[in-house]
């Protein structure tokens, strides 16, 4: 109720002689701060004096002074909430009741705490899970109702007296709720741990033994078995007898059933610890074991491999791979059931023994067409020789052999002819299904392996064919050797390298790209007139009159071809310059007079300069010089100069006469 002081602390604390006790404690006074605190041992209330009697272990006064003999007992609390105590060392006669007498300004309270001090260190307590099964991880717990800051301890785990190598986790609690030290060990027990003793040992800080607790492990496990066989090597021949015995070395709980298994399958009506096999056959070869069950589950023995030996059975041949491609590798495998395994093999190709081949596998690194046929084998072991089986067929496939392209036409072939070619071959596996031709063209194939080229081109130099099954084999190209008239005839200027100027030495070449046959004749022509019959046309000193359109022709036995017309352009400086006057060379003053500089030039005149009779240049640069209105003073001789990229030319003087008008004459 509200008239009580509120305390929190463990109800009872445990310790042993010479150890210490640490008492975690909290409180809340009814009013104000704590003014006086007395720790009694086994306090008794005296009704006469209305006070408590008993041994005073600790006393604090208002002035805060503590008697020097109270060093063993320490009040670690404060004036309003902490009442923690420490007794170090603690003695056997400290057992009993501790009384905490608390006084504030107006209120008093006695709080009781039980202290249990034993003569010797008390043992910890081991806690185990209700059931332990083999290989299932469990947690072992060792608990000691003791912990004190002034007295360090440790808990160690032992198995059959030997420290356990698994890491334990130790935890301590010193709280108002509980005081303990705990060690937890995670452990995966095996069936062999069944019945073994586990110890939790309490030690002081130096590892000195203080006390311990022990438990015996009860590890549930499936039966553990051993199998024995006669004969011990488990190798027999057909008709022999075999005995197998099953022994249980451990089972927890006790076993309930027994059975035998061959190759993982249970043998019917075999439920005893002995298995007797009489007059064994090869089919009884296999892996045997016994199985014994208990409530945990079935346990199995190790397997015994029983081998029943017999002579090889009729063999079969496996080919990797058929059909085989010529040049590839092939492996033959002789398959025959036998025990022991065959030690010798005899191989046959098309019924004939293959010399030097005695292994299970025959490897041919590079297959050739003649390797095709039937392969069979015979296997042999210590018990006898097997029969030869039916064998396997090897099919060797290869591209068509000895492919040739044949021209069916009479030679020579001329441009424009129709040419027929055929594609021949010697042998093929599988059969030829199609043909290819190089180069590709819009040609017809009237029948398989025949090519017809209509209007053969001059540049159809070579043709090759391929006969194809799964692969194509190409024949060597065959030359058509097509004859044709000269091609790409053109006129080429050899010299000069730059433009042609009047007076230059000029050479023109008649070029053509090809001709078959090679023997040719040349013809040069200008404006329909024959000029020469050489490959070159030469001019020692070209003149403007040589300019014009030139063509050359090239002939062979097939035909003749003309070049495109080629224009010969001769560049020359302005020539034949003259000044013409309009309307004439006599003009009345005030009218208009136009002087024109006429010339012959290639390229045309680009710049004109006009001069008077004094050779004074006039600031006019056009072909025409217009004088308007013309003055009498303009009478005189004029000349012009024309310039192009080749050079200059000048005209002779031309005289302009400007006469007075009737008006001027009348004024005079």
């Amino acid at each position: 109720d509200s008239s009580k002081w509120v305390f929190e602390h463990p109800e009872t604390l445990y310790a042993w002689e010479g150890a210490c006790v640490w008492i975690p404690c909290t409180y809340r006074a009814l009013d104000g701060d704590l003014e006086s605190f007395i720790l009694f041992h086994n306090p008794e209330y005296n009704k006469n004096t209305s006070k408590f009697d008993g041994t005073r272990l600790y006393e604090s006064t208002k002035d805060g002074k503590v008697p020097s003999e109270q060093k063993r007992v320490q009040f670690l609390g404060d004036k309003n909430k902490n009442c923690t105590l420490s007794i170090h060392p603690v003695h056997l006669n400290d057992s009993g009741q501790l009384g905490l007498r608390m006084e504030s300004k107006t209120e008093k309270w006695m709080e009781r705490i039980h202290l249990n001090v034993s003569e010797r260190p008390f043992p910890p307590h081991i806690q185990l899970p209700p059931e332990i099964q083999e290989s299932q991880e469990v947690t072992l717990t060792c608990l000691l109702n003791f912990s004190c800051y002034g007295y360090p301890i440790q808990l160690q785990w032992l198995l059959e007296g030997v420290p356990m190598r698994q890491a334990a986790v130790t935890s301590t609690s010193l709280t108002i709720k509980s005081v303990f030290t705990r060690s937890e060990l995670k452990f995966s027990p095996q069936w062999s741990h069944h019945g073994k003793i586990v110890t939790c040992q309490l030690q002081d800080a130096d590892g000195k033994f203080l006390s311990n607790d022990t438990v015996q492990l009860n590890v549930k496990h499936t039966p553990k078995l051993e199998i024995k066989v006669t004969p011990s090597d488990a190798i027999v021949r057909e008709g022999d007898s075999v005995t197998m015995t099953c022994e249980v070395s451990s089972s927890n709980p006790e076993y309930t059933t027994v059975s035998w298994l061959k190759d993982g399958t249970s043998l019917k009506k075999q439920n005893t610890f002995t298995l007797n096999l009489r007059e064994v056959t090869k089919d009884q070869s296999g892996k045997y074991c016994c199985q014994v069950s208990n409530d945990v589950g079935p346990g199995r023995s190790e397997e015994v491999f029983l081998q029943v030996q017999y002579a090889p059975e009729p063999s079969t041949v496996q080919i990797l791979h058929s059909p085989a491609v010529e040049g590839s590798q092939v492996e033959f495998l002789c398959m025959s059931l036998a025990n022991p395994l065959p030690t010798n093999y005899t191989w046959y190709h098309n019924g004939k023994e293959m010399q030097g081949r005695t292994e299970e596998k025959v490897h041919i690194p590079k297959i050739l067409p003649w390797h095709a046929g039937t392969y069979s084998c015979v296997a042999e072991n210590i018990l006898g020789t097997g029969q030869r089986g039916p064998g396997a067929e090897l099919d060797v496939q290869y591209p068509p052999k000895k492919v040739t392209t044949v021209i069916q036409n009479p030679m020579p072939i001329r441009e424009g002819d129709t040419v027929t070619l055929s594609c021949n071959y010697n042998s093929s596996n599988p059969s030829v299904t199609r043909y290819e031709w190089k180069p590709h063209g819009a040609w017809e194939e009237p029948s398989l392996g025949v090519l017809k080229i209509q209007n053969v081109g001059w540049d159809n130099t070579t043709i090759a064919c391929a006969a194809c099954n799964s692969w194509c084999s190409w024949a060597s190209p065959v030359a058509l050797n097509v004859q044709y008239a000269p091609r790409d005839v053109r006129v080429r200027k050899i010299k000069p390298l730059s433009e042609i100027h009047s007076g230059n030495s000029v050479s023109l070449q008649c070029d053509f790209s090809s001709s078959h046959p090679k023997e040719v004749q040349f013809f040069w022509e200008k404006n329909g007139r024959l000029l020469g019959k050489e490959s070159q046309l030469n001019f020692d000193s070209i003149s403007p009159e040589d300019a014009g359109s030139y063509s050359c022709w090239v002939n062979n036995s097939i035909g003749q071809t003309a070049s495109k017309a080629w224009t010969l352009e001769v560049l020359y400086a302005p020539r034949r310059l003259r000044v013409s006057m309009s309307p004439g060379d006599q003009v009345m003053e005030g009218k208009s007079a136009t002087l024109t500089c006429e010339s012959d030039a290639n390229p045309p005149v680009s710049h004109y300069t006009w001069f008077d009779w004094n050779n004074q240049s006039l600031p006019y640069h056009s072909q025409k010089l217009r004088l308007e209105p013309v003055k009498v003073q303009h009478s005189g001789a004029y000349w012009c100069q024309g310039t192009n990229s080749v050079g200059k030319g000048r005209s002779p003087l031309s005289t302009l006469t400007v006469y007075y008008s009737p008006e001027t004459i009348g004024r005079r």
């Epitope: 240049s617 217009r626 004088l627």
Partner: antibody, heavy 118, light 116 residues
Framework: EVKLVESGGGLVLPGGSLKISCAAS????????MYWIRQTPDKRLEWVAY????????FYPDSVKGRFTVSRDNAKNTLYLQMSRLQSEDTAMYYC???????????WGQGTSVTVSS | QPVLTQSSSASFSLGASAKLTCTLS???????IGWYQQQPLKPPKYVME???????HTGDGIPDRFSGSSSGADRYLSISNIQPEDEATYIC?????????????FGGGTKVTVLG
């Protein structure tokens, strides 16, 4: 009456550019060759550009070649002088003039002043 | 290129006759020149075109007092009965084409002062 009127002059920084114009009237502009002539502060006359009636031929003295460009628009009866990379020595009064029939300039404009200074 | 030489100034009494000279460099002695008049604060004005034989073409609005003549490389501009409005600078000029490049050169000008 033949009339030539220049415009576009002004103050320009060294290295700068300026385009001046000359509007012609009173004659058939497309028949005549035209000049630009400048008069320096010391009153000397210097020919700076010459263009044919069609605009096909142009001539310049070495002092302005590559910096000045003369052009004409016969449809607008206008003569132009584009001046670039101007120098202080280009400071002058710029006149346009018509070339007479043979040897001389028979009509001159009033001029436009160009000052090149920083 | 041709070079034109003129005396820098000349003074004449009102009503007197004046004769100004423009000399061409010797190899250009037959060349025709142009005479121009520039009154103060005005543009140059065409006076006449003068040939080496003395024949000339005179500009519009030029009074009959102005005439021209030639002697060798010298070209003369004559003014009879000189008037105050004739006070001006008189400049000669000549054009030429060298290596297909046209050029035009001016003389330094003669400054004419009319006294009285």
């Amino acid at each position: 009456e033949v009339k030539l009127v220049e415009s576009g002059g002004g103050l320009v920084l060294p290295g700068g550019s300026l385009k001046i114009s000359c509007a012609a009237s009173g004659f058939t502009f497309s028949d005549y060759y035209m000049y630009w002539i400048r008069q320096t502060p010391d009153k000397r006359l210097e020919w700076v550009a010459y263009i044919s009636n069609t605009g096909y031929s142009t001539f310049y003295p070495d002092s302005v070649k590559g910096r000045f460009t003369v052009s004409r628009d016969n449809a607008k009866n206008t003569l132009y002088l584009q001046m670039s990379r101007l120098q202080s020595e280009d400071t002058a009064m710029y006149y346009c003039a018509r070339h007479g029939i043979l040897y001389a300039m028979d009509y001159w404009g009033q001029g436009t002043s160009v000052t090149v200074s920083s | 290129q041709p070079v034109l030489t003129q005396s820098s100034s000349a003074s004449f009494s009102l009503g007197a006759s004046a004769k100004l000279t423009c000399t061409l460099s010797s190899q250009y002695s037959t060349y025709t020149i142009g005479w121009y008049q520039q009154q103060p604060l005005k543009p140059p004005k065409y006076v006449m075109e003068l040939k080496h034989d003395g024949s000339r073409h005179t500009g519009d609005g030029i009074p009959d007092r102005f005439s021209g003549s030639s002697s060798g490389a010298d070209r003369y501009l004559s003014i009879s009965n000189i008037q105050p409005e004739d006070e001006a600078t008189y400049i000669c000029g000549v054009g030429d084409t060298i290596k297909e490049q046209f050029m035009y050169v001016f003389g330094g000008g003669t400054k004419v002062t009319v006294l009285g």
